[in-house]
């Protein structure tokens, strides 16, 4: 899987879209994790409703919320109020029996607020580190990780 | 009407290469995923894989991955169940069935079965 | 991968009898649970799903119950054609695994 970037500016909302095959994943609920490490699982953030049918209901947990439109076969996640240690490797599932597949893998960046004047030392982006595999670039608010980008801060 | 219709018996020698086929009627065949399920005679049933034909996204069995092939051709909604050297213990009874999410708990259980084809491996 | 366990490997009952045949997942696997009824020379048929959900077409003498690792196949009153071998299914993980087969014979 590519991995696509998204970049919201902090104190603001981001919206994540995972388009996928709506007759290849129909009936399936799909999931909201973040990435635990290069290697490490993907931890549950949110899924969508427990009855497939009111998966256009938006469900939160916090400040995430997810919303899936099962017919236009798109994925929606709105992270509320951005902020800095949002930033990381997320994954859009779906869901069958107790596995998941990868629908995107998703890149979150959060970009300091121009109109606050605060330190943005604790921002977080991704380092510079060898190159990213299948990497393509797509701008808007989203892109793919650039060659020689890692989702993941070098550990020193 | 839904329905799987798997080729016919085989007889084969062992080392010689075969490809038999499920063909799909009745339904969109591309938005389905396709089992493959064998049984050995007397025995139980063993999943193989599966098959996505819309896009041919293919999951194996452990147990089968590297042994057999799995396709499908969605221009003729047909999937297919390939082996490049056939061994004796490859004999045994091979279905497709046609595999269903349920809305109720995203999960997917096989609601249509082929008839079943025959495989015999013998010198 | 996750082991299916079915017994007993074989009964035998009368038509009319009440059978219960007990399937165990060697995890827990929820709800996700299917039951299949297979005649001699035929492929199987789906009879339940979800544990407890019956497939469109199956008679209402039978029934699926349980969750987590432990499940029933309930044949209230046994027919004539319900004698058949009935394997489970767990649909939690892939690769998908089948009990061993439970043959229900005429006594």
């Known amino acids: 899987h590519n991995t696509t970037v998204f970049q919201g500016v902090a104190g603001q909302s981001l919206q994540v879209s995972c388009p996928y095959d709506s007759m290849k994943h129909w009936g399936r609920r799909k999931a909201w994790c973040r990435q635990l490490g290069e290697k490490g699982p993907c931890q549950r953030v949110v899924s969508t409703h427990n009855l497939w049918l009111l998966s256009f209901l938006r469900r939160w947990n916090g400040s995430t919320a997810i919303t899936d439109d099962t017919l236009g076969g798109t994925l929606t996640i709105t992270l509320r109020n951005l902020q800095p240690h949002d930033a990381g490797l997320y994954q859009c599932q779906s869901l069958h029996g107790s596995e998941a597949d990868t629908l995107r893998k998703v890149l979150v960046e959060v970009l300091a607020d121009p109109l606050d004047h605060r330190d943005a030392g604790d921002l977080w982006f991704p380092g510079e580190s060898e190159s990213f595999e299948d990497a393509h670039v797509e701008h808007s608010i989203s892109r793919s990780l650039l060659e020689g980008e890692i989702p993941f801060p070098p550990t020193s | 009407e839904v329905q799987l219709v798997q080729s016919g018996a085989e007889v084969k020698k062992p080392g010689e290469s075969l490809k038999i086929s499920c063909k799909g009627s009745?339904?969109?065949?591309?938005?389905?995923?396709i089992a493959w399920v064998r049984q050995m005679p007397g025995k139980g049933l063993e999943w193989m894989g599966i098959?996505?034909?819309?896009?041919?996204?293919?999951r194996y069995s452990p147990d089968f991955q590297g042994q057999v092939t799995i396709s499908a051709d969605k221009s003729i909604s047909t999937a297919y169940l390939q082996w490049s050297s056939l061994k004796a213990s490859d004999t045994a009874m091979y279905f497709c069935?046609?595999?269903?999410?349920?809305?109720?708990?995203?999960?997917?259980?096989?609601?249509?079965w082929g008839q079943g084809t025959l495989v015999t491996v013998s010198s | 991968d996750i082991q299916m366990t079915q017994s007993p490997s074989s009964v035998s009952a009368s038509v009319g009898d009440r059978v219960t045949i007990t399937c165990r997942a060697s995890?827990?696997?929820?709800?996700?649970l299917a039951w299949y009824q297979q005649k001699p020379g035929k492929a199987p048929k789906l009879l339940i799903y979800a544990a407890s959900s019956l497939q469109w077409g199956v008679p209402s003498r039978f029934s699926g119950s349980g969750s987590g690792t432990d499940f029933t196949l309930t044949i209230s009153s046994l027919q004539p054609e319900d004698f058949a071998t009935y394997f489970c299914q767990q649909a939690d993980s892939f690769p998908r695994t089948f009990g061993q087969g439970t043959k229900l014979e005429i006594k």
């Open positions: 995890q827990g696997i929820s709800s996700w």
């Open positions: 069935a046609r595999s269903r999410t349920f809305y109720y708990d995203s999960s997917d259980y096989f609601d249509y």
């Open positions: 009745g339904y969109s065949f591309r938005s389905y995923w």
């Open positions: 098959i996505y034909p819309g896009d041919s996204d293919v």
